[in-house]
Every structure is written in C-alpha cells, then in structure tokens.
C-alpha cells in the first residue's frame, strides 16, 4: 500500500536440524487478538496457510507441516518439531482483529557436518610436475548450510596461488537437504614437502556460534630426483675377518634409483661390479682380507638413464695371518732348554702370548718363549696367541706339542678293582713317554690300543673274571726304546656289604674300568682304592 511503512526485518530464530523450533508470535495486544491467529509459511514468495488458532485452540492445515505443529505458551508460540533444512524459510502469524497485522519470523537451520574425511594421493606427486597436482581430497558430509573448507600445510592455511596452489570445491545436496562438501587440493610440491603435514578444516555455524572440525593430518609421497649417492658400511668401526659386513648404497632421491656397487681392482686399475642382493646391498659374509679395497656406488635413474657416482670408500678388513711356530715339532731331553718363536702378519700391530694348553696359564707376553731345565712334566701343548688389542676378537692361535724324551710313565702304579666272578671286565691302562710307548698285558683277552696324543697311549682289555685271575691280578707293561714300566691291577671280589648305597650294581659290575679317568668319565660305580700319586 503506497505510503505504508517498510516492513520490519523478521525476527531470527536459529535451530539445529532435528530439534524443535519455537515460533513466538510477536503481535502486541493492540495489533491483534492472539486467540485468533493464522500461521503461514512463505516459500519463494508464496504464502501457505499451515495453522489456525481459534479461541486459543490450534488446528493444523493438511500438508507438509500437518504432523509437526503444536501450540505452546497459551497459544502465543507455535512449536515446529523435527526441523529439517527444508524448513529454513519465513513463517508469519497474522492476527484477525481489530485489524489484520502480521509478524514475520525467519527460521535459520543448522547442522554440523561429519568429521572431514581426508584421502591422500596414493600414487604420490613428482616435484617436477608441469602444473599443480592433486595432493589430497577432503569430504565433509551432511552439513547445513554449506560449510567452508580451509586447507593447511604444516599448520598454516593455504591460499590460492597461481600455478602453485589451487583448491577446487563442490557441493551436492543429499535427499535430506543436507550438503556434502567435496574439496581437492592441488599443489606444486617441492622436495621439502616430503615431510609436510596436510589437513583440511571445515568451518560451520550452529546456533551456539562458529565451530570447526579438522581432519587427520596426512603426508604425501613426494618423488624427486637423486642428487647425491653415498656408501654406508655396517658395522661401523674396525672390521675384522669373519665379520658379516654390509655395504649399502644410499641416495637422496625418491623413489631410490637402481644401484650397482663396484670394487677397484688394484692390479687392473679397473672397477669390477660386485653381486648385490635384491635390496642392492653387498653382503660380505664372512669378510676376508681380500675384500679390502676401494668401493663405489653407481646410481641409475631408469627413466632418464642418467647415472651418479658416489665418493669412493676404502674398506679395510683387518686380519691376522696363520700363526707360525718354530720349531714346529720340538723334541728335547730332560734338563735341556728350548726356545719357541711365534710369527704372524696382520693389518694392525700384534700382541703375542704363550699359554700352557692344559691349564690356559699365561707363560709369556711376547713372541718368544724360553724354557729351561726341562722336566718330563714340561711335555705337552703350548699355544701361541697372536691378537690385535684394538680389535676385540681378532686373533689366531697355533698349538705346538713339546715331547720330552723318556721311558714310559704310567698313569698309576697299582690299583684295586672290585669285581664279580664270571663277569666280563673292562680294564684300561694309560702310559706316556717319548718315543710313544706300546702297552702289553700279562693275561689273555681282547686288547685295543688308542693314541691319546703323540706321547700318550691308552690300552683297553676285555677279560673274563676267573678264580685264577682273582688270584694273580692283572699287569700292564708299557715299553719304548728308552725303557719299560708296569702297572698292577688287583682284583677283589665284591659282596653286598662292600657296595655303597648309591651303587648301580648292573653298570658298576659289568663295566669296571681301571683307568685314572674313571672317576670323571665312567658310569662305573665299583669302589676303588685311593689313587697313588707316584707316577712310576
């Protein structure tokens, strides 16, 4: 109507999807009687009657709002339940008397989108792409109104930048009226972006104010050419023969290039390619001194066939050569002297030690061992150990056996053996001397002889226990060019009272052994007299 005052701005009512909107008719008593009101929805400038109030009683009109409207607050407020995005429109109430006035309410509807779903480019991005390449996508589902997306790199928001950063977004309306926002970040990346963290953020509004949701952070596979190639050796530090050594070729490109490792040949002055495993690693196991030398790595870009060469790396596999001892097989008379000399080569300074084989006692620190006034007991093993003190575990040894000339020397002079009549007895007798003695027995039986070492012999006799044998006992005699010596084994019948409580009669009585080693090595439990210390 010309001259009529401009309509006031509608009252704003904000509500979340699914909740109830309370539409309060703001007509004053002078503007109309609230017991007689018509409610309309306005959509695309078209009014539709949705609710009538008569004498304070409400009545829904047929249509989309029929089931969702009710009166509250003594008829002054219309409640709209289960609000949907389609309800975002103007509602107006119109009083009937004294003259027709209306009050307008703008309903604004909100819904937080779901957590943003970020997906990174699974194939990666080369740094030399001609234009911005797709880095990641972000999807925010079921929000209202359309949320805003912001992309971040390392915590900083990304802005559109010509030929560098491009953000492309679109939205679709679901059947529910909610929006799904889709966004793709395109960017030209550089090598430094290989560790960059990207994420997307959705900004949206609710009746309570502005809010945001962030996606998880992702990193993008970034491909960049190799600029530098180098070799790494494991283990680090001093290497020694016998170690497992890995020579690995490394490059700063992604994906790694194809590698080959070569070793310089000092005689031909040419590099010879080494055989690497599937990962391009050269494994030396066990490492030998021949593996020492100059290694280098060549990296090939199979796309461009450009190759890069690493700095050469010297590999030193430390070693100790075979140890030589002179004299190699020493023989001496009792009372004489002997000088043993030890030699070896190494890539490092060597230390020598002489040890007695039987006791591991250190006799000398140095390559020369001098022995004076040699006794029979001096016969046996001497070990020279050549070691590199700076490299634990790098050592070699050589054993030399010293023989002292002398007549046979018995392990025992006499011994008592408990037996049972008619049992088969296993007797043993041990003697040493140089030259090596032979052993004979004074009774018939099955004898077998075995060398313990070049100067020592052990003879075993299987014999049936007879009354005559019990009476005479058994003698073993050892002889060599320098003399002879005898041991006597006295046989004594066992009875139950002579057996110890822990005896095992079956084994004890069937395999009696008359050897000085019985205590340590035999399962025999026959009782023995204490061993005499005399050595004949």
């Amino acid at each position: 109507v010309p001259g009529e005052a401009e309509q006031p701005a509608p009252e704003l009512v904000e509500v979340e999807v699914g909740s109830t909107a309370l539409l309060k008719c703001g007509l004053s008593q002078s503007q109309g009687n609230l017991s007689h009101v018509d409610w309309f929805s306005v959509h695309k400038e078209k009014r539709t009657l949705i609710f009538r109030v008569r004498q304070g009683q409400g009545q829904s009109e047929p249509g989309e709002y029929e089931q969702r409207l009710s009166l509250q607050d003594r008829g002054a407020t219309l409640a709209l339940t289960q609000v949907t995005p389609q309800d975002e429109r103007i509602f107006l109430c119109q009083g009937k008397r004294p003259r027709s006035q209306e009050y307008r309410i703008q309903l604004r509807v909100y819904k937080a989108p779901e957590e943003p779903n970020i997906q990174v480019n699974p194939l990666g991005i080369p740094v030399n792409s001609k234009e911005p390449e797709e880095v990641a996508t972000c999807v925010g589902r079921n929000g209202y109104p359309i949320p805003q997306v912001i992309w971040y790199k390392n915590g900083r928001p990304l802005k559109e930048e010509k030929n560098r950063v491009h953000i492309q977004s679109s939205q679709t309306v679901e059947s529910s009226g909610l929006y799904t926002l889709q966004s793709i970040l395109k960017a030209q990346l550089v090598k430094e972006d290989k560790d960059a963290q990207f994420y997307c953020e959705l900004n949206y509004r609710l009746p309570s104010g502005n809010h945001m949701k962030e996606s998880r952070e992702v990193t993008v596979p970034v491909f960049y050419p190799t600029e530098k190639v180098w070799l790494e050796v494991e283990p680090v530090g001093m290497l020694k023969e016998g170690d497992r050594v890995e020579i690995r070729c490394l490059a700063d490109g992604n994906p790694p290039p194809h590698f080959s490792i070569s070793k310089g040949n000092p005689s031909t002055r040419e590099a010879e390619e080494e055989t690497t495993n599937d990962n391009g690693v050269l494994v030396l196991e066990p490492a030998r001194k021949e593996h020492s030398g100059r290694y280098e790595c060549q990296a090939w870009n199979l796309d461009t066939m450009i190759s890069l060469l690493s700095e050469p790396q010297e590999l030193l596999v430390n070693y100790v050569s075979d140890v030589r001892v002179s004299p190699a097989a020493p023989e001496r008379q009792e009372g004489s002297s002997l000088t043993l000399t030890c030699e070896a080569e190494s890539s490092q300074d060597l230390e020598f030690q002489w040890l007695r084989e039987e006791t591991d006692q250190v006799l000398e620190r140095g390559p020369v061992l001098q022995l004076h006034d040699l006794k029979r007991e001096a016969g046996g093993g001497y070990r020279c150990v050549a070691s590199v003190p700076s490299i634990p575990g790098l050592n070699r040894t050589q054993l030399v056996k010293l023989a002292i000339f002398g007549p046979p020397w018995m392990a025992f002079k006499e011994r008592k053996v408990w037996v049972k009549e008619n049992m088969v007895l296993n007797l043993s007798c041990e003697a040493s001397g140089h030259p090596r003695p032979t052993i004979s027995w004074n009774v018939n039986g099955t004898a077998s002889e075995g060398d313990q070492d070049p100067q020592r012999v052990l003879s075993t006799l299987n014999v049936l226990v007879t009354p005559e044998l019990l009476e005479t006992g058994v003698e073993c005699t050892a002889s060599n060019d320098l003399g002879k010596n005898t041991s006597i084994l006295f046989l004594e019948l066992v009875n139950l009272t002579t057996l110890t409580p822990d005896s095992n009669t079956t084994t004890g009585l069937s395999t009696s052994t008359a050897s000085p080693h019985t205590r340590a090595n035999s399962t025999s439990t026959e009782r023995k007299l204490p061993e005499p210390e005399s050595r004949g």
């Epitope: 779903n117 997906q119 990174v120 480019n121 699974p122 194939l123 991005i125 080369p126 792409s129 001609k130 234009e131 911005p132 390449e133 797709e134 996508t137 999807v139 679109s170 889709q182 966004s183 793709i184 395109k186 998880r216 596979p221």
Partner: antibody, heavy 118, light 106 residues
C-alpha cells in the same frame, strides 16, 4: 554421460609390444585421471598404470620397465603400451576413470581381452 | 606393497539373506577402501568408497564398515541381481585389490 572404451589387438605374440587405446567421453582428461587395470581369466584385478588430470604418469613397479602411458587430450584418448608381452599377460584390460574428488574408480570401460600366444 | 585379503573366497546364500564379506589390509589404511561388484563378462562397478560411503545410485541394502585394517561389506537382504563377485580395493598407498569373493545362489 560418462563412457570409456578400450581398443587394440585381441591377439599378440610373445615378445611383441601391446598398444591399447582408451577413448573417453562425457568428461575431460584434464579434470579426471585415468588408470589401466587388468584381470587374467578367472583371477583378481590388478592395477597397471595411471595418468593424472595434470598429466603425471604412474606405473605398477612390477611392470615399470615394460610400460608407458600417455594421453592426447584433444582426442580424449589415453594410450598404454606394454613391451615384451608374455603368455602370462593374457588378460582383460580395462581403463577406468578416477573420481574427481576421490581415489577410487567410478566409471570403467567394458574391457578388452588380449591373448598372448604364438 | 599393501596386501588385501578377502574372506571367504566364495559363499552360497539365498535371496533375502544377510551377507557379510570381509577384507583385511596388511597395514593400516585408515578408511582408504572401496568395494566393487563384478558380474561375469562385465566391468567392475563401485558400490562403496571411503570404507562406508554409498556410491550414488547404489541401493541402500549395501553398506560398508571398518577402519584401519579390517573392513566389511554387508548386503542386508540379498536380491537376485546381487549374485556376483565382490572385490575390495585399497587406495592408501598405490592401488591393490583383494582376490575377490564369489557370491553364489544356494
């Protein structure tokens, strides 16, 4: 509507080179990437190669040295070449469009069966 | 490379049945997973993307769930046209497909 159609030889000899063409319509190769996926008879799907909307090429490392993928945006075509063909390469070869806002394949060609035999 | 293992490799069911197909990734792929349906002599058709989003035009009886390494495709009430082979595919690092699950009529 979006369509993709594969074309190329149905039979190739061992050691020969296979060239397949994917002709697309209903979208632009500068807005969607295209992949090649193959399926040997009675077996599973296997991704071979891709070209992005920006023109970047990607290959399955199992075949990389034998593959080449390229495109002609004016003809709306993507071309795959695979050298040194072997009977184990006998398969149905599909081209597929990558969804613009995701990394899955939303449209596929009907596929072309390539047999490698002497 | 990420391996995708589907189970079962085949299953028999009747119209109206509720069916689940499982897919296991050899490492965490978050929700970078799609499900495809393939009928004999036809190209695959995407059903589900981002592990649980239904592709436009796909009936709501299809649903996807899971995250990380374990994923499931569920068909709530089998229809005659659903008998086919189903593949899962990861797109977290490169592209790899499961070996397929053949769904047959009992």
């Amino acid at each position: 509507q979006v369509t993709l159609k594969e074309s190329g030889p149905v039979l190739v000899k061992p050691t020969e080179t296979l060239t397949l063409t994917c002709t697309v319509s209903g979208f632009s190769l500068t807005s969607n990437g295209v992949s090649w996926v193959r399926q040997p008879p009675g077996k599973a799907l296997e991704w071979i190669a891709a070209i992005s909307s920006g023109g970047t090429t990607y290959y399955n490392s199992a075949f990389k040295s034998r593959l080449s993928i390229s495109r002609d945006t004016s003809k709306s075509q993507v071309v795959l070449t695979m050298t040194n063909m072997d009977p184990v390469d006998t398969a149905t070869y599909y081209c597929a469009r990558r969804y613009g806002y995701g990394w899955y394949f939303d449209f596929w060609g009907q596929g072309t069966l390539v047999t490698v035999s002497s | 490379d990420i391996q995708m293992t589907q189970s079962p490799s085949s299953l028999s069911a009747s119209v109206g049945d509720r069916v689940t197909i499982n897919c296991k990734a050899s490492q965490n792929i978050y929700n970078s997973l799609a499900w495809y349906q393939q009928k004999p002599g036809k190209a695959p058709k995407v059903l589900i993307f981002n592990a649980n989003s239904l592709q436009t035009g796909i009936p709501s009886r299809f649903s996807g769930s899971g995250s990380g390494t374990d994923f499931t495709l569920t068909i709530s009430s089998l229809q005659p046209e659903d008998f086919a082979t189903y593949y899962c595919q990861q797109f977290y690092s490169g592209y790899t497909f499961g070996q397929g699950t053949k769904l047959e009529i009992k």
